[in-house]
């Protein structure tokens, strides 16, 4: 029942916005809009990991706004009724249904920009977001399975003779802990009601020529390695060093 090994190809790239909050977006530039997109009627779905407490911008299909009839954002969050934010070009009106989270808004006026933004992403923003654009040429969809990531707090210490404990506390999803060299380890994880997971690995090294051990924590938000020198004195506590 160990934690799943994260897919490091999904490591999040963020850029600084307003020198305060990291912001991430999967949006294309206008010049990237392809002429043949109108021929691709298939729905495009993207799995998107986003760090908690950053800003996220979600985009509609790259359709020129002049061709637009209606834009609808459909937002499905866990345990809540589906929220829709719609804009009708002909009457220049917007309408919202079952939308209660004030941090999820249009980036600007929808007649100028159809993108959706989430300000200060929280765990509650885990869910499915879909933009539906109605045009004379048909309906175009782009969906996002948004996975909110929480960086675990990593600690490593020696608590008994030749026994070390590595913890990745309150991460999302669960971190994966590995050791160099491998020891006699017991790893356990706990799922908290706020959606985070704590992983704890306790290892013992019987072989006395092992003097330094490294705990490597893999997580979608980034990897971390800590090392510690094993003390021979029983009961002595020693904290870890960060690579």
């Amino acid at each position: 029942e160990g934690a799943a090994q994260p897919n490091n190809s999904l490591m999040l790239q963020t850029s600084k916005e307003n020198h305060a909050l990291a912001s991430s977006s999967l949006c294309m530039d206008e010049k990237q809009i392809t002429q043949n997109y109108s021929k691709v009627l298939a729905e495009v779905n993207t799995s998107w990991p986003v760090k908690m407490a950053t800003n996220a911008v979600l985009c509609c299909p790259p359709i020129a706004l002049r061709n637009l009839i209606i834009i609808t954002w459909e937002i499905i969050l866990r345990g809540q009724p589906s929220c829709t934010k719609a804009y009708k070009k002909e009457t220049n009106e917007t309408k919202e249904t079952n939308c209660t989270d004030e941090r999820i808004t249009w980036v600007s006026r929808p007649d100028q920009n159809s993108d959706l933004q989430i300000r200060t992403v929280a765990i509650t923003h885990d869910g499915y977001y879909r933009c539906i654009m109605v045009t004379p040429d048909g309906n175009f969809h782009r969906g996002y399975h948004l996975q909110v990531l929480v960086t675990p707090e990593v600690t490593l210490f020696q608590n008994r003779n030749r026994t070390a404990v590595c913890k990745a506390v309150a991460g999302k999803p669960a971190a994966h802990i590995s050791w160099i060299p491998e020891g006699d380890c017991a790893t356990k994880q706990e799922y908290w009601s706020n959606g985070t997971v704590t992983v704890k690995s306790t290892c013992h090294w019987e072989v006395h020529n092992v003097s330094t051990v490294t705990c490597h924590v893999s997580h979608l938000t980034g990897n971390k390695s800590l090392y510690i020198e094993l003390l021979p004195v029983p009961g002595a506590k020693k904290s870890a060093k960060l690579y």
Partner: antibody
Framework: QVQLQQPGAEFVKPGAPVKLSCKAS????????MNWVKQRPGRGLEWIGR????????HYNQKFKDKATLTVDKSSSTAYIQFSSLTSEDSAVYYC????????????WGQGTLVTVSA | ENVLTQSPAIMSASPGEKVTMTCSAS?????MHWYQQKSSTSPKLWIY???KLASGVPGRFSGSGSGNSYSLTINSMEAEDVATYYC???????????FGGGTKLEIK
């Protein structure tokens, strides 16, 4: 299969100590936390605390910090809870329960030990 | 500490009747879990992660909710459902497990 075995009952005089046991089998003892839960007659459930058999790390509910002491014996895969000086308020069923797997909370419970404090 | 308040404390339902009990949390949660406890037996994990049924739980049970408000529903009451149901949450900061006061379900 996973089993947590507890004695059925303990009778204790007020002011006396008691040590309850919970013998685990059917899984690797050091790979899960062992929790203790109190239930007074006709009342709800209260989490007392938990211990990691791998390294004896303990977390207590502050309410029980001065009342209960948790220990383990890895060689016999047994967890213990010891109470120092019992009063009638401590008369209750005490359950051990396992946590720390892929399911949240306590997926496996012992049958409980009924502690009766009476002169 | 996140306080869980269950209501009603006691309820009774006729066979075939739909039953809903609620659990309110003083602090917002992502997941709520539920235990079933029958008379003189240990509690059993019944519903976890708000809406997932534990192994062996009949399909007439369901769980729902978000934020501070959660519920357990039985769409058609049966005699074997007579029990006390506890909502439950675990928090990592500070480390604490909390149970609601319980809803005792009886049959008419």
């Amino acid at each position: 299969q996973v089993q947590l075995q507890q004695p059925g009952a303990e009778f204790v005089k007020p002011g006396a100590p008691v040590k309850l046991s919970c013998k685990a089998s059917g899984y690797t003892f050091t790979s899960y936390w062992m929790n203790w839960v109190k239930q007074r007659p006709g009342r709800g459930l209260e989490w007392i605390g938990r211990i990691d058999p791998a390294d004896s790390e303990i977390h207590y509910n502050q309410k029980f910090k001065d009342k209960a002491t948790l220990t383990v014996d890895k060689s016999s895969s047994t967890a213990y809870i010891q109470f120092s000086s019992l009063t009638s308020e401590d008369s209750a069923v005490y359950y051990c329960a396992r946590s720390g797997g892929w399911l949240p909370g306590f997926a496996y419970w012992g049958q409980g030990t009924l502690v009766t404090v009476s002169a | 500490e996140n306080v869980l308040t269950q209501s009603p404390a006691i309820m009774s339902a006729s066979p075939g009747e739909k039953v809903t009990m609620t659990c309110s949390a003083s602090s917002s949660l992502i997941y709520m879990h539920w235990y079933q406890q029958k008379s003189s037996t240990s509690p059993k994990l019944w519903i976890y992660d708000t809406s997932k049924l534990a192994s062996g739980v009949p399909g007439r049970f369901s769980g729902s909710g978000s934020g501070n408000s959660y519920s357990l529903t039985i769409n058609s009451m049966e005699a074997e459902d007579v029990a006390t149901y506890y909502c439950f949450q675990g928090s990592g900061y500070p480390l604490m497990y909390t149970f609601g006061g319980g809803t005792k379900l009886e049959i008419k």
